[in-house]
């Protein structure tokens, strides 16, 4: 089974979150994709989405969010620029496939934005998250209004307990890899 993990990104205000979501090229290349925030107990909220049909490597900007869909590589690149403390939260990529429900992509992103300098995190043996920091880097599409109840979730538990979804086997597993910490002034 594919493992669903929650990746934790710790950044400072003003920095950029720069992540990617991969998808099955043959199935979803031109499908509309979206970036959502998941708040505890609430329906996922769509913050930005690609055009419909999605255009190849054509950046779409909605406020401080930039989406870039590389059809030929099966990758959606998501950038959130000039991060603010209030951007902290759990995010996910989904693929719209009406009339079916949105298809969730791996992995979920737990974003923690802090003011000023934040120390390098240590490796936590019991953590279900990977933690790392990213250096800063520096057209609007209409999104469907509906959100599937099936994508409503809570943040993954802080244990190794399995998390199941109705139509696929997904396990939340212990992952403690820490990636390098580049520093930019």
């Amino acid at each position: 089974a594919t493992k669903l993990t929650e990746e934790k990104y710790e950044l400072k205000e003003g920095q950029t979150l720069d992540v990617k979501c991969d998808y099955t090229l043959e199935k979803f290349a031109s499908s509309q994709k979206a970036w959502q925030i998941i708040r505890d107990g609430e329906m996922p909220k769509t913050l930005a989405c690609t055009e419909r049909p999605s255009k190849n490597s054509h950046p779409v900007q909605v406020g401080r969010i930039i989406l870039e869909d590389y059809h030929d590589h099966g990758l959606l690149r998501v950038r959130m620029v000039n991060l603010q403390v209030e951007d902290s939260g759990l995010y996910q990529c989904v693929i719209y496939q009406p009339p079916k429900e949105p298809h969730m992509l791996f992995d979920r992103i737990r974003l923690v934005v802090t003011k000023g300098f934040s120390g390098t995190p240590g490796s936590n043996e019991n953590s279900t998250q990977n933690v790392y920091k990213i250096p800063p880097t520096t057209t609007k599409a209409l999104c469907p209004l509906y959100t599937s109840p099936r994508t409503v979730t809570q943040a993954p538990p802080k244990s190794t307990a399995d998390v199941s979804t109705p139509d696929s086997e997904i396990n939340l597993t212990n992952v403690t890899d820490i990636i390098r910490v580049p520093v930019f002034n």
Partner: antibody, heavy 122, light 107 residues
Framework: QVQLVQSGAEVKKPGASVKVSCKAS????????INWVRQATGQGLEWMGW????????GQTQKFRGRVTMTRNTSINTAYMELSSLRSEDTAVYYC???????????????WGRGTLVTVSS | DIQMTQSPSSLSASVGDRVTITCQAS??????LNWYQQKPGKAPKLLIY???NLETGVPSSFSGSGCGTDFTFTISSLQPEDIATYFC?????????FGGGTKVEIE
Amino acid sequence: QVQLVQSGAEVKKPGASVKVSCKASGYTFTRYDINWVRQATGQGLEWMGWLNPNSGNTGQTQKFRGRVTMTRNTSINTAYMELSSLRSEDTAVYYCARGGYTSAWRWYFDLWGRGTLVTVSS
Amino acid sequence: DIQMTQSPSSLSASVGDRVTITCQASQDINNHLNWYQQKPGKAPKLLIYDVSNLETGVPSSFSGSGCGTDFTFTISSLQPEDIATYFCQQYDKLPLTFGGGTKVEIE
């Protein structure tokens, strides 16, 4: 020991296919992308594409679309790259390389296999 | 595709010399630039990522700088073991592309 171990050299005829393996050890295989890069003798480096070992999803450059297949077997921490319809200009050393974290836009290759020489000759 | 132009394609210098290699991108790559070293018959080795960050275990005699489209890789004091070909690589846009390489020799 953190390493990528590749399969041995291959000699193929034009039109045939070759499948190169890349076995990862010393780290969590499913957490980092595996990329394939090739280098013709005396030439530069050419990125072919990537594989997410967790999802199994892959992407290739336009040049190799339809000719290259990237797969993995997570039970043995091994990635594979199969190139079909071989021609003489495919003669090169093929490297697997560990990329950045699967969810991060971090495309640097910090761990490389030793390379597999594929010779295409009639 | 983003073109990466490296210069010079080869150079010869003396032990102890300061060596500089440049890499020019065909468009702004937002500091998404890495440098690799490749010794004859070996796989490439990551030296520097994101313009100026030294990979773990890489000697401080190697450094990188630049922004936008113009980047520089420097060996502050050339040593015999630095004989190799050096490549830059961008990852701001897909496909990932490499420079043509700079072969460094000792005269």
